[in-house]
Interface confidence: medium
Amino acid sequence: APVRSLNCTLRDSQQKSLVMSGPYELKALHLQGQDMEQQVVFSMSFVQGEESNDKIPVALGLKEKNLYLSCVLKDDKPTLQLESVDPKNYPKKKMEKRFVFNKIEINNKLEFESAQFPNWYISTSQAENMPVFLGGTKGGQDITDFTMQFVSS
């Protein structure tokens, strides 16, 4: 692939893991023991985009799947989706903006802000087993902080 990626898993600040829920949706729930194998492994690609000291543009694909998290307008609302792409062309250095997230690191916690929709973040609900979504509020009830765990290639 044109851009080398980092394999990782993500957990929200309440330690909920992310798993597939149907073919095009992720949900967040607490996993233990062997169930941890269900969690999604992301392929994080470092792409070109606006960057500052603590804001790094990345794309989040699902490892060994031709699916990427993307941000689009649905019914006039910024929405998170899993989008299918041509694996021959992805990942690439210059990803379309809908695929790009600004990875923001604060005290070893990560936020993922949509590059397409500033101040909208990958979010999870406090409740168990709910979809991962794009949220427009930080510091409220919804969770926007994540930790990353390396996964060997």
């Epitope: 851009v3 080398r4 980092l6 470092f46 070109q48 790094i56 690191e105 390396f150």
Partner: antibody, heavy 123, light 106 residues
Framework: QLQLQESGPGLVKPSETLSLTCTVS??????????WGWIRQPPGKGLEWMGN???????HYNPSLKSRVTISVDTSKNQFSLKLSSVTAADTAVFYC????????????????WGQGTTVTVS | SYELTQPPSVSVSPGQTASITCSGD??????VCWYQQKPGQSPVLVIF???RRPSGIPERFSGSNSGNTATLTISGTQAMDEADYYC?????????FGGGTKLTVL
């Protein structure tokens, strides 16, 4: 402002082990998105990457040196270290420690902070 | 093993444009960084991710990368730009440096 400082003996005997330490100041070695590397430069020659380490302790080494190089990290002292075994005169060089950004060098962010370098002579 | 090839030396007159090349197999598929090293000093990152400048690096430094060749361009070269320049890329968990190019400002 994050700074790096190499330290260690300037003279090592052939067949012995070269040991250097890099002390990180002005920032934490435990910041998860950084990696830490060692690079050397023989007199009058170019840069040669030796290896990287991550705060978690995982390492990548130059295949040509892999059997002789060990890099370790001590988060409590905010330091990382290099050991190069079975040295010969060909290992005489200036040794630099450096900080890389964004977990892996393939991210393209490069090594943005370097120490001033320390000269090690094998004789 | 992967190799990056640079010309050993490049000369330029003050105020002119200097171009330093770095070639490697399908290099355009990788990110390239460039470092400047003046005599007796540590390397300094001048370009990352092919074409981006760290803060504090003058605008006269620019980079490009496509096909098998990455290029560092210094426009309006100044005497202070005289230094060794190294390209750097990454291959299979390994950091690769080019052999370096000595830029002489005549």
């Amino acid at each position: 402002q994050l700074q790096l400082q190499e330290s260690g003996p300037g003279l090592v005997k052939p067949s012995e082990t070269l040991s250097l330490t890099c002390t990180v100041s002005g920032g934490s070695i435990s910041r998860s998105s950084y990696y830490w590397g060692w690079i050397r430069q023989p007199p009058g020659k170019g840069l040669e990457w030796m290896g990287n380490i991550y705060y978690s302790g995982s390492t990548h080494y130059n295949p040509s040196l892999k059997s002789r190089v060990t890099i370790s990290v001590d988060t409590s002292k905010n330091q990382f270290s290099l050991k190069l075994s079975s040295v010969t005169a060909a290992d005489t060089a200036v040794f630099y420690c450096a900080k890389g950004r964004e977990y892996i060098s393939s991210s393209g962010y490069g090594m943005d902070v370097w120490g001033q370098g320390t000269t090690v002579t094998v004789s | 093993s992967y190799e990056l090839t640079q010309p050993p030396s490049v000369s330029v007159s003050p105020g002119q444009t200097a171009s330093i090349t770095c070639s490697g197999d399908k290099l355009g598929n990788k990110y390239v960084c460039w470092y400047q090293q003046k005599p007796g000093q540590s390397p300094v990152l001048v370009i990352f991710q092919d074409s981006r400048r760290p803060s504090g690096i003058p605008e006269r430094f620019s980079g490009s990368n496509s096909g098998n060749t990455a290029t560092l361009t210094i426009s309006g070269t100044q005497a202070m730009d005289e230094a060794d320049y190294y390209c750097q890329a990454w291959d299979t968990s390994t950091v690769i440096f080019g052999g370096g190019t000595k830029l002489t400002v005549l």
